[in-house]
């Protein structure tokens, strides 16, 4: 029953950590306008791993595409393989782990071959995680170089007579959302492989056994004793924290931009 | 169709506060914002203040301490309050509302306001 | 706040001729984001509230004739009449919409010779 348990808490919180690594690579507000210290602007700027996105304070949206593939950052694309390879290994493991659930009888199935398929799932779980979690840290070191570049820039080449408003850049809810989801998937998969232990057992069938009683032909036949050894049954309760988080897709698409570095 | 219509006082004396009303119609003040302008006769435009869809509001900086814009949206109306009124605060004063690009692209016809004892 | 200085503050032409005005703004009024100018022209007729012309620093707004054409970027921009008529003279302002507070310039004066 405990492994039953452990088995279907880690496929959920699985579940709802791949939903959010999806959703953390589809949001745009990877990066956001940075507004402290600045001067007030009527606009605001964000963007994403697919395009960028400007909110007029008139409440347009104008969001536009990156177009291009060879003119983005090779950051920027490793963070978009690193999400789409988490993505892509977490629902293969989604998919197995639901034919390795105990509570779900698929034919004539062996335990070992759950167990198999739960252990899979779990390190598939685990990797996604993972990917995911690099792909955002990577995402937040390069904001934060871009930060403190601009930064510099801000105060430094101000001889001029015109001055120019420094766009930088600061994290994103997107960040937020892929930092809990990569732990809610990672923690999924920790669990299912627990689970995987238990779903092996170590099977002994102790056979008939035939005792001759001196003078009497009384055969004593105990019934076939099953011993099975329960691993990692010990599941603590864990409560779930899933970061609420909106994506705002209000747009009405019209221009934007591609400056990362 | 978008319409935007000033009613203020006309006379006011210095010292005292300045209030218009801004109706609108033909959009939701939820959604889009209002801005104020004003312009003394025979000078220039001056941006006053803003009061944005969300309720969130800008003012110039020189009238921060005595602007004050609001709005009820049931009513669709927006306020401006302009206290310690001086006589170079005599001007016509215009609503318009932002479009894209943040232009104010409709235009109320203005109200008239002398500051004068 | 961003300072606005438009030149010349008049301008005196004859019908069909072309005319430029400029507007300088003392920051750039230039978007990263979007690579979008936020400056805004208007024109005013006499006892008239302002009409909106071009925002964006070229984008003319729907319904105004094309001789008029807005340029520029950064910090220097220019409003080109290309044939004035009659019916074109006023003053016209330019408009910071990028940075609070939102100024305005002190305006050009168009005048028919």
């Known amino acids: 029953m405990a492994v039953t348990a452990c088995q279907g808490l880690g496929f959920v919180v699985s579940l709802i950590g791949i939903a959010g690594i999806i959703a953390a690579t589809c949001m745009d507000q990877w990066s956001t306008q940075d507004l402290y210290n600045n001067p007030v602007t009527a606009v605001f700027n964000y963007q994403g791993l697919w395009r960028s996105c400007v909110r007029e304070s008139s409440g347009f949206t104008e969001c536009r595409g990156y177009f291009t593939l060879l003119g983005l950052p090779a950051m920027l694309q490793a963070v978009r393989a690193l999400m789409i390879v988490g993505i892509v290994l977490g629902a293969i493991g989604l998919l197995v782990s639901i034919f390795a659930l105990k509570c779900i009888r698929i034919g004539s199935m062996e335990d070992s071959a759950k167990a198999n398929m739960t252990l899979t799932s779990g390190i598939m779980f685990i990797v996604s995680g993972l990917c995911a979690i690099a792909g955002v840290s990577v995402f937040a070191n390069m904001l934060v170089t871009n930060f403190w570049m601009s930064t510099a820039n801000m105060y430094t080449g101000m001889g001029g007579m015109v001055q120019t408003v420094q766009t930088r850049y600061t994290f994103g809810a997107a960040l937020f959302v892929g930092w809990v989801a990569g732990g809610l998937t990672l923690i999924g998969g920790v669990m299912m492989c627990i689970a995987c232990r238990g779903l092996a057992p170590e099977e002994t069938n102790y056979k008939a056994v035939s005792y001759h009683a001196s003078g009497h032909s009384v055969a004593y036949k105990p019934g076939g004793f099953k011993a099975s050894t329960g691993f990692g049954s010990n599941t603590k309760n864990k409560k779930i924290y899933d970061g609420g988080a909106r994506t705002e897709d209000e747009v009405q698409s019209y221009p934007s931009k591609h400056d990362y570095v | 169709q978008v319409q935007m219509k000033e009613s203020g006082p006309g006379l006011v004396a210095p010292s005292q506060s300045l209030s218009i009303t801004c109706t609108v119609s033909?959009?939701?003040?939820?959604?889009?914002?209002v801005t104020w302008v004003r312009q003394p006769p025979g000078k220039g435009l001056e941006w006053l203040g803003v009061?944005?869809?969300?309720?969130?509001?800008n003012y110039h900086s020189a009238l921060t301490s005595r602007l004050r814009i609001s709005k009820d949206k049931s009513k669709s109306q927006v306020f401006l309050k302009l206290s310690s009124l001086q006589t170079d605060d005599t001007a016509t004063y215009y609503c318009a509302k932002p479009g894209r690009g943040n232009a104010l692209d409709y235009w109320g016809q203005g109200t008239s306001v002398t500051v004068s004892s | 706040d961003i300072v606005m200085t438009q030149s010349p503050s008049s301008l005196t032409v004859t019908a069909g001729e072309k005319v430029t005005m400029r507007c300088k703004s003392s920051q750039s009024l230039l978007n990263s984001g979007n690579q979008k100018n936020y400056l805004t022209w208007y024109q005013q007729k006499p006892g008239q509230p302002p009409k909106l012309l071009v925002y964006?620093?070229?984008t003319r707004e729907s319904g105004v004739p094309d001789r008029f054409t807005g340029s520029g970027s950064g910090t220097d921009f220019t409003l080109t009449v290309s044939s004035v008529q009659a019916e074109d003279l006023a003053v016209y302002y330019c408009q910071n919409d990028y940075i609070f507070p939102l100024t305005f310039g002190a305006g050009t004066k168009l005048e028919l010779k």
């Open positions: 033909g959009f939701s003040l939820t959604t889009y914002g």
């Open positions: 009061i944005w869809g969300d309720g969130s509001t």
């Open positions: 964006w620093a070229s």
